[in-house]
């Protein structure tokens, strides 16, 4: 089995208030089965940004069709960026578990920071 890797190619993403930010994440394997989630921050206080399995995330859309059985692209777009959105974003693979899924591997993170205001 190829060992799964989480690829977040950008270490830093400069964004503009009011615009849409795209956070990239791809995986190198579909196994083990389990969902991919996006968080801002680390540790117990991290904020859930997107869960492919469930939930309502009105400002978040996926770049790819996650219902494709061979999908390996879990990139997301966050609309209407505000200063409160800055931080480091991690895509995290969970493997299935009972009663709760188990964190399996995290991407290295992408820091979102505010760039210059549009002139």
């Amino acid at each position: 089995e190829e060992e799964l890797q989480m690829i977040q190619p950008e270490k830093l993403l400069l964004v503009t208030v009011g615009k849409t930010a795209t956070l990239h994440c791809t995986v190198t394997s579909l196994l083990p089965v389990g969902p991919v989630l996006w968080f801002r921050g680390v540790g117990p206080g991290r904020e859930l940004i997107y869960n492919q399995k469930e939930g309502h995330f009105p400002r978040v859309t996926t770049v790819s069709d996650l219902t494709k059985r061979n999908n390996m692209d879990f990139s997301i777009r966050i609309s209407s960026i505000t200063p409160a959105d800055v931080g480091t974003y991690y895509c995290v693979k969970f493997r299935k578990g009972s009663p709760e899924n188990v964190e399996f591997k995290s991407g290295p993170g992408t820091e979102m920071a505010l760039g210059a205001k549009p002139s």
Partner: antibody, heavy 118, light 107 residues
């Protein structure tokens, strides 16, 4: 209320074609992958084909590849199964089913009966 | 292929377990589907190994470990008489499969 309603079943002769439809309501159809599952008389369930939410990716069991085609029209909230070169072994009740995020099934239609007989 | 017993029986109030084997825990999710009569619409009682749809009674539960999944009905009732099919999605092959079905008789 979430509903899946199949139609298009009937009696056909071996070698003929049939197109099944599944009308979806009560949920955002364009956000879900869908599948067709059949059940031959006195037999168990058999998954046939699946299609991604956007319709670009399709998946089939080997025994129907090349004969059956799954498709969808998200503007009409409809799922289809085109069945060609039918044989008696295709006689079954055909169900459409909505997929969960991990490609299991959470809701099923009532089914439509296809009978292939000379 | 998924393997499950052809039949099980129980008295009302007893606990019933139906085991489905043949999958790989690493690559497989399981579901359980209830069919009360042949040709009638199946009803999903468990998906994603252990997730129960909101309209399914809490006496139905599911679990998975190793190469098997288990459907448990705690305090079985007469209305639970049905055929129960286990199903699986394999992330290696992108294919769904079903077991042959288990007929539950409530005595």
């Amino acid at each position: 209320d979430l509903q899946l309603v199949e139609s298009g079943g009937g009696v056909v002769r071996p070698g003929e074609s049939l197109r099944l439809s599944c009308a979806a309501s009560g949920f955002t159809f364009s956000s879900y992958a869908m599948s067709w599952v059949r059940q031959a008389p006195g037999k168990g369930l058999e998954w046939l084909a699946g299609i991604s939410a956007g319709g670009s990716d399709t998946y089939y069991i080997d025994s129907v590849k090349g004969r059956f085609t799954i498709s969808r029209d998200n503007s009409k909230n409809s799922l289809y199964l085109q069945m060609n070169s039918l044989t008696a072994e295709d006689t079954a009740v055909y169900y459409c089913a909505r997929e969960t995020w991990n490609h299991l099934f959470d809701y099923w239609g009532l089914g439509t009966l296809v009978t292939v007989s000379s | 292929a998924l393997t499950q017993p052809a039949s099980v029986s129980a008295n009302p109030g007893e606990t019933v377990k139906i085991i489905c084997s043949g999958g790989d825990y690493y690559s497989t999710y399981y579901g359980w589907y209830q069919q009360k009569s042949p040709g009638s619409a199946p009803v999903t009682v468990i998906h994603s190994d252990d997730k129960r749809p909101s309209d399914i009674p809490s006496r139905f539960s599911g679990s998975a470990s190793g190469s098997a999944a288990t459907l448990t009905i705690t305090g079985v009732r007469v209305e639970d008489e049905a055929v129960y099919f286990c199903g699986a999605y394999d992330g290696r092959t992108y294919i769904n499969t079903f077991g042959a079905g288990t007929t539950l008789t409530v005595l």
